[in-house]
């Protein structure tokens, strides 16, 4: 175009994609009457008439801009809507009078790219590679113009470095005219980079100024040879029989080598391989004292076939053996004495305790329990507890039953039972003695006997309440080689005046139960076990 070289630089108008560009024709009234203006778009030095203003009336020309132009600002401004990257070109207004004059506008279009998407190389990078390997790829979609990418490692920007760091960027143009940028970071990494955080940053411009968007941070799998192998035992601390114990191999290489765990055979001193689970963990559940011993781990690098051995580790599974009590089944006459001795073995120092089985009362702290002037009440269970104080929960116990010779001894001497005529009554009678007594009833009925413990027996009787039975009452008799004893149950008919609550009897339409709740003998004692502690 003649005289174009002398033209001043075009006015710069900057807009974002999708917005409206206001192209103000800078011709002064002296240069040309704005009531008669032609607007052109200039692309590759080719002018295309896009809009005409005649006598102040604006109208678009057919073509790509036809639907997007309108005259504004009393004819001085042409508005271009829904700006696209393809609109980045020179626009020119040309006034016709008094002589042809031009005013040029350079439209610059911008669009922020989407958040950068970073993908780490899933295959990882060996530290001994001869040249930079692909670490990660950063993609910034739909930006305009092409954004700049900066790679960061641990918050520091990475620069191109011969044979160490190489950044390879490329871009594609979408059908929209927007750019998608792809940048590949290649680097030679060292073992210390296994925890390094990499991210990419896109720098771009908008009419409002410079901006940036950062990707998320990623770590790349770094492969390096194993230098050390070691064993780890869980749980940490003192182990006891019954625990779940896990022995695992660990290594400082990536990927870890192939592991095998061996235990030294105490008799042959040879290392014997143990069977591990799929994860290479040796699980001892429940742990036993036989699991104690010397363990070691072997790590085999399947690429180099180099084998590494861990430091051996002693495993001690603490135990308490079966508890033995002597005598095992003591029998004594009333008034005599008895010494009970408790024995057990352990991997740790033991503590012994003797408890009365029925009450839980601690009788002695130590392995020997001495009982003097034995009474009938002294008969029954005694428990020895062997425990390791330093390892909570590690203990074993043994129960011994002490038998005191004597005639039967009734749980009650006599009892009143409220009944209804023609009901089936369920009666019970309890007796103890050594040898253990048997119980008989003075009436016909269905009787059954249960041994409660070596010296105690319980008999239950189901009987129909008849007038004769009401007359005679019911007796139960206990007998052994040393004598006999009797309990009496008095039956009384229920009526509204006599019906009173009785904690010792249960009555219903068809059953009534009479069970001993207290001992009839003045010498008997009964202790309750202590309540268990409530743990929050």
């Amino acid at each position: 175009v003649p005289g174009e070289a002398e033209q001043p630089a075009p006015e710069l108008v900057e807009v974002e994609v999708g917005s409206t560009a206001l192209l103000k024709c800078g011709l002064s009234q002296s240069q040309g009457n704005l009531s008669h203006v032609d607007w052109f778009s200039v692309h590759k030095e080719k002018r295309t008439l896009i809009f005409r203003v005649r006598q102040g009336q604006g109208q678009s020309e057919p073509g790509e801009y036809e639907q997007r132009l309108s005259l504004q600002d009393r004819g001085a401004t042409l508005a271009l809507t829904q700006v696209t990257p393809q609109d980045e070109r020179i626009f020119l207004c040309q006034g016709k009078r008094p002589r042809s004059q031009e005013y040029r506008i350079q439209l610059r279009v911008y669009k922020a790219p989407e958040e950068p998407n970073i993908q780490v190389n899933p295959l990882g990078i060996p530290v001994n590679s001869k040249e930079p390997e692909e670490v990660a790829t950063c993609v910034g979609r739909n930006g305009y113009p092409i954004p700049q990418v900066i790679w960061y490692k641990n918050g520091r920007p990475l620069k191109e470095e011969k044979n160490r760091v190489h950044i390879q960027s490329s871009q594609t143009v979408e059908s929209s005219g927007l750019y998608t940028l792809q940048s590949i970071l290649k680097a030679q990494l060292v073992k210390e980079d296994k925890d390094a955080q990499f991210y990419c940053e896109l720098n771009y411009r908008l009419p409002s100024g410079n901006h940036m968007k950062e990707s998320r941070e990623v770590t790349v799998p770094v492969f390096y040879p194993t230098e050390k192998v070691w064993l780890e035992v869980e749980p940490v601390g003192m182990l006891k029989e019954g625990d779940r114990v896990e022995i695992r191999c660990l290594a400082d290489g990536n990927p870890p080598p192939h592991f095998s765990i061996s235990k030294q055979n105490p008799s042959t001193r040879e290392a014997e391989e143990e069977t591990t689970n799929d994860n290479g963990v040796l699980v001892l559940e429940p742990a036993r004292k036989e699991h104690s011993g010397r363990y070691e781990c072997q790590g085999l690098d399947l690429d180099t076939m180099i084998s590494l051995l861990s430091e051996p580790q002693e495993l001690l599974v603490n135990y308490v053996s079966d508890v033995r009590v002597s005598p095992a089944a003591p029998e004594r006459q009333e008034g005599s004495s008895l010494t009970l001795t408790c024995e057990a073995e352990s991997s740790q120092d033991l503590e012994f305790q003797w408890l009365r089985e029925e009450t839980g009362q601690v009788l002695e702290r130590g392995p020997v329990l001495q009982l003097h002037d034995l009474k009938r009440e002294a008969g029954g269970g005694y428990r020895c507890v062997a425990s390791v104080p330093s390892i909570p929960g590690l203990n074993r116990t043994q129960l011994v039953n002490v038998a005191i010779f004597g005639p039967p001894w009734m749980a009650f001497k006599e009892r009143k039972v409220w009944v209804k005529e023609n009901m089936v009554l369920n009666l019970s009678c309890e007796a103890s003695g050594h040898p253990r007594p048997t119980i008989s009833w003075n009436v016909n009925g269905t009787a059954s006997e249960q041994d409660q413990d070596p010296q105690r027996v319980l008999s239950t009787l189901n009987v129909l309440v008849t007038p004769e039975l009401l007359e005679t009452g019911v007796e139960c008799t206990a007998s052994n080689d040393l004598g006999k004893n009797t309990s009496i149950l008095f039956l009384e008919l229920v009526n509204l005046t006599t019906l009173t609550p009785d904690s010792n009897t249960t009555t219903g339409l068809s059953t009534s139960t009479a069970s001993p709740h207290t001992r009839a003998n003045s010498t008997s004692t009964e202790r309750k076990l202590p309540e268990p502690e409530s743990r929050g």
Epitope: R54, Q55, G56
Partner: antibody, heavy 117, light 106 residues
Framework: QIQLVQSGPELKKPGETVKISCKTS????????MHWVKQAPRKGLKWMGW????????TYADDFKGRFAFSLETSASTAYLQINNLRNEDTATYFC??????????WGQGTLVTVSA | DIVMTQSHKFMSTSVGDRVNITCKAS??????VAWYQQKPGQSPKLLIY???TRHTGVPDRFTGSGSGTDFTLTINNVQSEDLADYFC????????FGGGTKLEIK
Amino acid sequence: QIQLVQSGPELKKPGETVKISCKTSGYTFTDYSMHWVKQAPRKGLKWMGWINTETGEPTYADDFKGRFAFSLETSASTAYLQINNLRNEDTATYFCVSYDYDAVSYWGQGTLVTVSA
Amino acid sequence: DIVMTQSHKFMSTSVGDRVNITCKASQYVGAAVAWYQQKPGQSPKLLIYWASTRHTGVPDRFTGSGSGTDFTLTINNVQSEDLADYFCQQYGNYRTFGGGTKLEIK
């Protein structure tokens, strides 16, 4: 003051031709563009197009291409609208409208054209 | 072509009230919009041009607003003489009128 005076009402048969005049005064005729607007009975306004009073170049809206013609008699400061081959649907009031460069408009009083067999 | 849509064909109001008459362009027209009032048997009368500039002699109870594609003519303190048809028109690219809104006084 600026005035636009239009010719009187017309009663025409289908197929005939009508020519409406719009005489202006109070301003330089060639300074302002001249537009034509149609208003059918009890309907809205429809822009028909305009004529450049400097060059005589007409511009027609899509619905008014073919049978409609804008012309000028600059010496008489008069604009004309001619409708050929009249149809019933051409029955309407036609307005001439002059616009200055600032988009201020000046309207004629309107001419009613009735097309009836 | 740019289409101007006046969604309300009729609007009913009372004397003293305020009324908003709206107009939507099918594409961006910036501020190149005028509003006209037409009473029965008369030529349209220019009220507003360049979207918000009041024409000479138009009472200040008439106000125009909007830009781009959405425009509003507001009449404050409606008077009985405001009973008329109201048209919007764009002139950013050729010219087109809206379909009109008839203002009725209750």
